[in-house]
Interface confidence: low
């Protein structure tokens, strides 16, 4: 609230504004009859120095003139790029309690003269949009910097715009307002920039251009695709463009994929046909402009077209497999099994699949539709059965695909030998083997076959396959495939007309069981000991297991227990044990163990045997 | 055919920790670690059969540790507070098939064996 320079004046020589490096001279002056009441002689001015009003400096040491209680010249260097205060203040000595009184201040700027500015760039957007160019200032100037644009052309065309920097602004680009039509397509135009502020300036090279040089495209707009004949791989792309571009770019590209098909179209009037499409597949469609075949920029692309093909009629073969199971002795029920066609096959919705189960001899020929991938029938045991299997969309079906019914297992010459699994991670088993020794008809091919042992999984779950051709003799499975699950993995030797096969259980990751058997029941029979269990909940199993163990021992010892390994079977839950004395109290509990390690023990049971000892 | 290859033997105080390691070329479900001390026979010190049960003869039973890394194929033997009886060749025998009935004592229940490591404790 001080009226600031009533008491006095505050001068700069040369300037308040000064290049850097340069010194300035600060002048604090009295006006008349102002000062320290009582004793003139004992005004002091002083100098402080302010940078973002904070006080940096008292310079009173930098004081180079002094008319006592009157005036006072200040030396100030070594000052930084930007505004500094600096404020004159009066202070009376013969008063030590009053504070140094305002008298009045000034602000010096210190900068750099302007660099020419360089690489201007102009551009026009579209045919009706108006010229604007940008360039590259150069260093900062710490100053306020006006830059004039300059456009001149032919028939005396003259046009400038200006704009300034300062430290809230920058001018790096300007509109001028006017636009380039094409009938000048050929004409040249000249631009330059000018810069100025108070320490100097300094002017652009002369930049020239042609109409074509600056004008950029609209990119096309109200993009279509027309199917000829609702054909799903070919289309008529239509878009609106400028009335002068000669020049289309055409991008497209599956909605998955991650590279683009390009297109270059000259004088194609907002028209291309496109005959390489995948039918029933999302596309994605984009266009640019170009106004001359050599010269000119692009447009942007377009606003993308999102369409879906049309379908056509499936192609490829089906992946049919099937399992058989006697019914009784004359009948026997075939489940087919097939795996959906990719979709670059599919071309389209699959509606349903044409089943036919056909006795070779033509007796009897059994056809239906499922829209699920299997089918179960019950047929009679004689005669020698093939199978075909065609999927069908809105267009047409697929060629079928023919497969002999024949015994899976039934050769034992066609079974290959030494098949092993080995758990590659946590979600691929490598399944090997060797071929069948006495073939007496050659293997066409090999198929793994795979399924969770879990209850019910035959009936519930359909197999898992794959085919290997007939001089391969491995497989990574890993559809399907969960860790801590035990597999029933089959490989199948297929000639023309037989089959043989060999199984293996495996998994891909493993741990020891969360528990043990659970004793059922210990019965006494000829002097030996039945102990009789339930299998581990499949769920607990974590993995294949490989054994069971029994252990026992004498009640109330603290003996380590006896053991007695037994090979895992699923189908086996009791086995005999004869080394236990008679009349004697035994605990009994069962362990299992996978290739991960033992489980816990399950239930103990008591048991006294009555028998002579063994 | 399973490799095995001891490794970790060599000479401690009265006292001190040592750790046997026996790294199997194929998979194995029963590993174990007899000793042969100089003029006498070779005897039965643990053994870890699966993955987690494990037996000790009573001479260092709450001394040793036996334990096994699935993954690697690899038995371990972690001896504390070691004795000059401790003094022997230390040897890992391994066994693929699954024995009927044995409690994994006998070494004729081993089918693979080590070369041996020294483990020699002073006084």
């Known amino acids: 609230n001080i009226d600031v320079c009533k008491l006095g004046t505050v001068t700069v020589q040369p300037a308040p504004v000064i290049p850097l490096g340069s010194a300035a001279n600060i002048s604090c002056s009295l006006n008349p009859k102002q000062g320290c009441s009582h004793y003139p002689s004992s005004n002091e001015l002083i100098l402080l120095k302010f940078v973002n009003d904070v006080l940096v400096e008292n310079l009173h040491g930098k004081k180079v003139h002094d008319h006592t209680g009157h005036s006072s010249t200040f030396q100030v260097t070594n000052l930084s790029l930007g505004m500094t205060l600096f404020v004159c203040k009066l202070n009376c000595s013969n008063s030590q309690k009053k504070p140094p009184v305002p008298v009045c201040g000034v602000e010096i700027s210190v900068g750099v003269a302007p660099e020419p500015p360089q690489n201007i760039s102009c551009v026009q957007e579209g045919e009706n949009g108006t010229v604007a160019c940008s360039w590259n200032s150069g260093k900062v100037t710490y100053l306020k910097t006006n830059y004039t644009l300059q456009l001149s052309g032919p028939n005396n065309l003259t046009c400038q715009k200006q704009c300034f920097s300062d430290n809230r602004q920058n001018c790096n680009r300007l509109d001028l307002g006017i636009n380039l039509s094409p009938d000048l397509a050929e004409s040249r135009f000249i631009v330059r920039v000018t810069a100025i502020n108070d320490l100097g300036n300094s002017s652009s090279l002369p930049h020239t251009f042609t109409f074509l040089d600056i004008v950029i495209p609209l990119p096309p707009w109200d993009i279509r695709i027309n199917f000829l004949n609702a054909s799903g791989s070919r289309g008529t792309l239509q878009w609106e463009d400028e009335g002068q571009v000669v020049l289309n770019q055409l991008r497209y590209q599956p909605l998955n994929s991650t590279s683009w098909n390009m297109v270059n179209a000259t004088n194609a009037k907002g028209k291309y046909d496109l005959r390489d499409l995948r039918p029933f597949t999302e596309y994605e469609f984009q266009i640019s402009s170009k106004l001359h075949l050599s010269g000119g920029s692009w447009s942007n692309w377009s606003e993308s077209l999102r369409t879906r093909t049309p379908e056509e009629e499936p192609v490829g073969i089906l992946d049919i497999w099937y399992m058989k199971q006697d019914i009784d002795y004359d009948r026997q029920q075939i489940s087919l099994f097939w795996k959906s066609l990719n979709p670059s096959e599919a071309r389209g919705k699959i509606l349903h699949y044409q089943v036919t189960l056909q006795e070779v001899t033509k007796k009897t020929t059994l056809q239906n539709t499922t829209r699920h991938t299997s089918w179960t029938r019950v047929i009679p045991r004689t005669g020698a059965w093939t199978a075909s299997v065609s999927a069908a969309n809105s267009k047409g079906a697929s060629a079928p695909t023919h497969i002999n019914i024949v015994d899976l297992c039934g050769t034992g010459l066609l079974a290959p030998h030494q098949v092993s699994a080995k758990s590659e991670n946590m979600d691929n088993i490598l399944v090997t083997w060797q071929p069948p020794k006495k073939a007496d008809s050659a293997v066409r091919e090999y198929i793994v076959e795979w399924r969770a042992l879990q209850p019910g999984s035959i009936t519930k779950f359909p197999p898992h396959w794959l085919r290997i051709p007939p001089d391969n003799m491995s497989a990574l499975i890993s559809e399907n495939i969960k860790p801590y699950i035990c597999y029933e993995i089959r490989v199948h030797a297929l000639s023309e007309s037989q089959g043989g096969c060999s199984s293996i259980r495996g998994d891909s990751k493993h741990k020891a069981p969360v528990s043990g058997p659970h004793i059922t029941a210990i019965t006494e029979k000829k002097e030996r000991l039945f102990i009789s269990w339930t299998h581990i909940p499949f769920p607990e199993q974590r993995g294949c297991i490989l054994h069971y163990r029994i252990y026992w021992k004498e009640r109330d010892s603290t003996a380590q227990p006896e053991l007695c390994e037994i090979q895992y079977r699923r189908s086996q839950n009791s086995h005999p044990i004869s080394s236990l004395q008679p009349r004697v109290t035994y605990v009994l509990w069962m362990t299992a163990v996978t290739a991960a390690g033992e489980s816990p023990q399950g239930n103990e049971r008591e048991f006294c045997p009555q028998g002579k000892a063994n | 055919q399973v490799q095995l290859q001891e490794s970790g033997g060599g000479l401690v105080q009265t006292g001190g920790s040592l750790r046997l390691s026996c790294a199997a070329s194929?998979?194995?479900?029963?590993m174990a670690w007899f000793r042969q001390a100089p003029g006498k026979e070779r005897e039965f010190a643990a053994v870890i059969i699966g993955g987690d049960r494990t037996y000790y003869a009573n001479s260092v039973k709450d001394r040793f540790t036996i334990s096994r890394d699935n993954a690697k194929e690899t038995v371990y033997l972690q001896m504390n507070n070691l004795k000059p009886e401790d003094t022997a060749v230390y040897y890992c025998?391994?066994?693929?098939?699954?024995?009927?009935?044995?409690?994994?004592?006998?070494?004729?229940?081993?089918?693979?064996w080590g070369q041996g490591t020294q483990v020699t404790v002073s006084s």
């Open positions: 194929g998979r194995t479900y029963a």
């Open positions: 025998a391994a066994n693929r098939r699954l024995y009927n009935s044995g409690r994994g004592y006998s070494q004729s229940e081993y089918e693979y």
